[in-house]
Interface confidence: low
């Protein structure tokens, strides 16, 4: 539908509050280092301009594209070159190159200070003094640290953030009310950011076809009663939404997401029986709820897949006529029958099926050639099943912290060139798969575990892409989206790695460790563990365990000492010497 003014169209569709919030998110995700006040000023200028276009769509510049308007506005920032360096060169380009250039400069690991949570009373005072600024600051701080955060979902988080403060700042015990809610929002926010990052990586690195295949599989699992045509329509619309958000088109994305939620709710009878509750909620909650809705029950009388995809004499004819549609139907039919499989496994099966048809439909006897294609699926299914079984057993035996440590050692030996903070962050997240998924029954373990691991390994891939140091990581990250996890699983100890020089400073600790939270103390210990493995990649589990046990005892002892700093200095030297001896350093 044609609109004289795109900016007026989106302002009217979204309303002023959402329009301003989304423009702030967009600007903060592009210019991640800019001060809050500068962004607020830019957003206010854009909003005032949008209002003039709403009043008169023919007014000057109202016909310009959003990329042109927003890019022009970002390029007015005076300190662009000194703050962002070569990103300023983007401003010399025309659209769409300029926007592509801004996108390429988004930084997954910006050099920003850690967000420190103030005292509850301080936060409540700030909330009451100026609620609007307080909430804008939340959007700004999250968006600049997570430049691919799914913008309409961030509006939902902000709504919950506001609700938490509204409720808890008038509670008798403000802290008891507020802190658990903020912890939950923080953890959910990190997970949401990582999930969206994978969607954007999928679109940007592997293209629309890869994303659509993922969406066909996931939506077919979720809506197994929906017809293929219905699933295809949802996939096309969902792809458009995510392409827009990943491309920085946040107003279009939020608008189209709202339209998609509306469509799903208007057609829920032909989509899923599980949508009723979601569809009774307000817009932001509705969209979130639909995205998280449980899988509908599978239709009872689904016929065997073999009839249409192996036994039929028309397999090659159907495949040749419309390859992507036929493969899409295969994926849909397989996925709706297998809510117990991970999406990445379903995509591996579809890829195997495609490869087989490519080969066999050119053969003398195609049917004879592809007759056993389903037998090729067995090892592909068993590999993740066995891996999850082994790792859940290890998790149940060790508990989360020690399971994370086992993964830290495993991954540091595989890719020792990767930076220590990245190895710690990624291995800690990999280790969380245990508490997240091992509690589930067999039928839910694989989709939980393997699809979660895809999200975490994507974090490794995007962090590594910024400063590539390991050919093995690059290879696993770029060769195949669906085979990333098997690729990393298959890596053995890197025999080419030259151990890091021993540096006593790395293993020198101070009394400040005693005041850290349990989580931060764990990170300190895990950082030391990674460094140990980098110094001594051939160290055995037993050797590393002995050193780590000594280290834990040393921290505990010195944190109880009267003169903590002296204890850390003297006992630390002894610990380093003992560790060197134990590891033969």
């Amino acid at each position: 539908d044609a609109h004289k003014s795109e900016v007026a169209h989106r302002f009217k569709d979204l309303g002023e509050e959402n329009f301003k919030a989304l423009v702030l998110i967009a600007f903060a995700q592009y210019l991640q280092q800019c001060p809050f006040e500068d962004h607020v000023k830019l957003v206010n200028e854009v909003t005032e301009f949008a209002k003039t276009c709403v009043a008169d769509e023919s007014a000057e510049n109202c016909d310009k594209s959003l990329h042109t308007l927003f890019g022009d506005k970002l390029c007015t920032v005076a300190t662009l070159r000194e703050t962002y360096g070569e990103m300023a060169d983007c401003c010399a380009k025309q659209e769409p190159e300029r926007n592509e250039c801004f996108l390429q400069h988004k930084d997954d690991n910006p050099n920003l200070p850690r967000l420190v949570r103030p005292e509850v009373d301080v936060m409540c005072t700030a909330f009451h003094d100026n609620e609007e600024t307080f909430l804008k600051k939340y959007l700004y701080e999250i968006a600049r640290r997570h430049p691919y955060f799914y913008a309409p979902e961030l509006l939902f988080f902000a709504k919950r953030y506001k609700a938490a403060f509204t409720e808890c700042c008038q509670a008798a015990d403000k802290a008891a009310c507020l802190l658990p809610k903020l912890d939950e929002l923080r953890d959910e926010g990190k997970a949401s950011s990582a999930k969206q990052r994978l969607k954007c990586a999928s679109l940007q690195k592997f293209g629309e076809r890869a994303f659509k295949a993922w969406a066909v599989a996931r939506l077919s699992q979720r809506f197994p009663k929906a017809e293929f045509a219905e699933v295809s329509k949802l996939v096309t619309d969902l792809t458009k939404v995510h392409t827009e958000c990943c491309h920085g088109d946040l107003l279009e994305c939020a608008d189209d997401r709202a339209d998609l939620a509306k469509y799903i709710c208007e057609n829920q009878d032909s989509i899923s029986s599980k949508l009723k509750e979601c569809c009774e909620k307000p817009l932001l909650e509705k969209s979130h709820c639909i995205a998280e809705v449980e899988n509908d029950e599978m239709p009872a009388d689904l016929p065997s897949l073999a009839a249409d995809f192996v036994e039929s004499k028309d397999v090659c004819k159907n495949y040749a006529e419309a390859k992507d549609v036929f493969l899409g139907m295969f994926l849909y039919e397989y996925a709706r029958r297998h809510p117990d499989y991970s999406v990445v496994l379903l995509l591996r099966l579809a890829k195997t099926y495609e490869t087989t048809l490519e080969k066999c439909c050119a053969a003398a006897d195609p049917h004879e050639c592809y007759a056993k294609v389903f037998d090729e699926f067995k090892p592909l299914v068993e590999e993740p099943q066995n891996l999850i079984k082994q790792n859940c057993e290890l998790f149940e035996q060790l508990g989360e912290y020690k399971f994370q440590n086992a993964l830290l050692v495993r991954y540091t030996k595989k890719v020792p060139q990767v930076s220590t903070p990245t190895l710690v962050e990624v291995s800690r997240n990999l280790g969380k798969v245990g508490s997240k998924c091992c509690k589930h029954p067999e039928a839910k373990r694989m989709p939980c575990a393997e699809d979660y691991l895809s999200v975490v390994l994507n974090q490794l891939c995007v962090l590594h892409e910024k400063t590539p140091v390991s050919d093995r990581v690059t290879k696993c990250c770029t060769e195949s989206l669906v085979n990333r996890r098997p690729c990393f699983s298959a890596l053995e100890v890197d025999e080419t790695y030259v151990p890091k020089e021993f540096n006593a400073e790395t293993f020198t600790f101070h009394a400040d460790i005693c005041t850290l939270s349990e989580k931060e103390r764990q990170i300190k210990k895990q950082t030391a563990l990674v460094e140990l493995v980098k110094h001594k990649p051939k160290a055995t589990k037993e050797q590393l365990k002995a050193v780590m046990d000594d280290f834990a005892a040393f921290v505990e002892k010195c944190c109880k000492a009267d003169d903590k700093e002296t204890c850390f200095a003297e006992e630390g030297k002894k610990l380093v010497a003992a560790s060197q001896a134990a590891l033969g350093l």
Epitope: H67, P96, E208, R209, T239, K240, K323, D324, V325
Partner: nanobody, 115 residues
Framework: EVQLVESGGGLVQPGGSLRLSCAAS????????MSWVRQAPGKGPEWVSA????????RYAESVKGRFTISRDNAKKTLYLQMNSLKPEDTAVYYC????????GSQGTQVTVSS
């Protein structure tokens, strides 16, 4: 850098035909859906048609359905728009874009339908 260069526009009588081309460079053309967008004088951009990365899935605005056909040749990194039964209201500058965005940045190609 991303470049999209349209060609094939011109002056044509009502009922006539034109074939527009869009040559792409600087990105993995075969991995992205593409669209045609047009902008008539004094109006905002209007989405015309889209095609998915493989060329299997095509979509059209109601105003052009049955008259326009979108296609692509991934080997040649080129997008096409075959326009038949042209009407005066099809007069506009036509742009190709990545994805289904109506944002435009290339020069476009002018199509004028007039007797």
């Amino acid at each position: 850098e991303v470049q999209l260069v349209e060609s094939g526009g011109g002056l044509v009588q009502p009922g006539g035909s034109l074939r527009l081309s869009c040559a792409a460079s600087g990105f993995t053309f075969g991995s992205f859906g593409m669209s045609w967008v047009r902008q008539a004088p004094g109006k905002g951009p209007e989405w015309v048609s889209a095609i998915d990365s493989g060329g299997a899935d095509t979509r059209y605005a109601e105003s052009v359905k049955g008259r326009f056909t979108i296609s692509r040749d991934n080997a040649k990194k080129t997008l096409y728009l075959q326009m038949n039964s042209l009407k005066p209201e099809d007069t506009a500058v036509y742009y190709c874009t990545i994805g289904q965005s109506t944002s435009r940045g290339s020069q476009g190609t002018q199509v004028t339908v007039s007797s």
